[in-house]
């Protein structure tokens, strides 16, 4: 069965210092899937951030960078210059 596992449950981030979120795929080969990232904020709203290849939700393209690491079978989301408004729970998902 396919499973996407976050590398860390909690990621402490400093304002302005680039941060990387990683999701490991188990049981399947990541290159065969489109990876999506979402953010859930306090109001329980799920906001779309990124989908392969190079598709970003409104307002996310300048500060977020999505990618996959074929070698490590990982999905990666970089926050280039984190600020307080980037706080929340981030979710990775996949589809074909």
């Amino acid at each position: 069965a396919i499973e996407l596992v976050p590398e860390h449950q909690t990621v402490p981030v400093s304002i302005g210092v680039p941060a990387t979120l990683r999701c490991s795929m188990k049981g399947e080969a990541i290159g065969n899937y489109y990876i999506n990232w979402y953010r859930k904020t306090q109001g329980n709203t799920m906001t779309f951030i990124y989908r392969e290849k190079d598709i970003y939700g409104p307002g996310f393209k300048d500060n977020f960078q999505g990618d996959i690491d074929i070698a490590k079978n990982l999905a990666v989301l970089k926050i280039l210059a984190p600020s307080e408004r980037d706080e929340g729970s981030y979710y990775c998902a996949c589809d074909t």
Partner: antibody, heavy 125, light 110 residues
Framework: QVQLQESGPGLVKPSETLSLTCTVS????????WNWIRQPAGKGLEWVGR???????NYNPSLKSRVTMSIDTSKNQFSLNLSSVTAADTAVYFC???????????????????WGQGTMVTVSS | SSELTQPASVSGSPGQSITISCTGT?????????VSWYQQHPGKAPKLMIY???KRPSGISNRFSGSKSGNTASLTISGLQAEDEADYYC??????????FGGGTKLTVL
Amino acid sequence: QVQLQESGPGLVKPSETLSLTCTVSSGSISSYYWNWIRQPAGKGLEWVGRIYTIGNTNYNPSLKSRVTMSIDTSKNQFSLNLSSVTAADTAVYFCAREGYYDSSGSFFPGAFGIWGQGTMVTVSS
Amino acid sequence: SSELTQPASVSGSPGQSITISCTGTSNDVGSYNLVSWYQQHPGKAPKLMIYAGSKRPSGISNRFSGSKSGNTASLTISGLQAEDEADYYCCSFAGATNVVFGGGTKLTVL
């Protein structure tokens, strides 16, 4: 046991396009990456390229301008087109399944665990 | 995409151990723990012997082992047997867009 079988013309004229198909039998085409690798007579192996089941591709940089790969998951087949061939493209062409899963479900790319028997392609007029 | 460097030939007597080296660069062998080794008998397709540097696929004898140090990977065959005589190729993942093979090593069992 999954098996791979290459098919296509054994003789191609210079400047024409070499076209090969690999059929995956006794197993699914999902869960792995699919590759073409060639071997000129008496020489070493050369990676041509890979295709993912969603259709994305990676090609050997030295062949990139001439290579196109495609996949048809409904038929359990993937294909190679190599354009503008010359005598230097004469080789045995293998299709191969890439990737190995360990007991924990971790996937390791870069390992070609199942190969076709190879098909000889000669470029000559 | 230059190939990895292997010795053209190695030889050993039955029962002995031999090691085949595979030297790459920091862009391939040195950057990824994804070196694989293949055995190829004349007229046959290659067979995977080692993956991810040192892991053995099921069904492969524990006489075959792999290791890596820096930009060089190695395949060791212990207790050499006549059926081990073949060509051996190393291969390294070199980023999502490339895979490189070694030039091959002919193993002769004396």
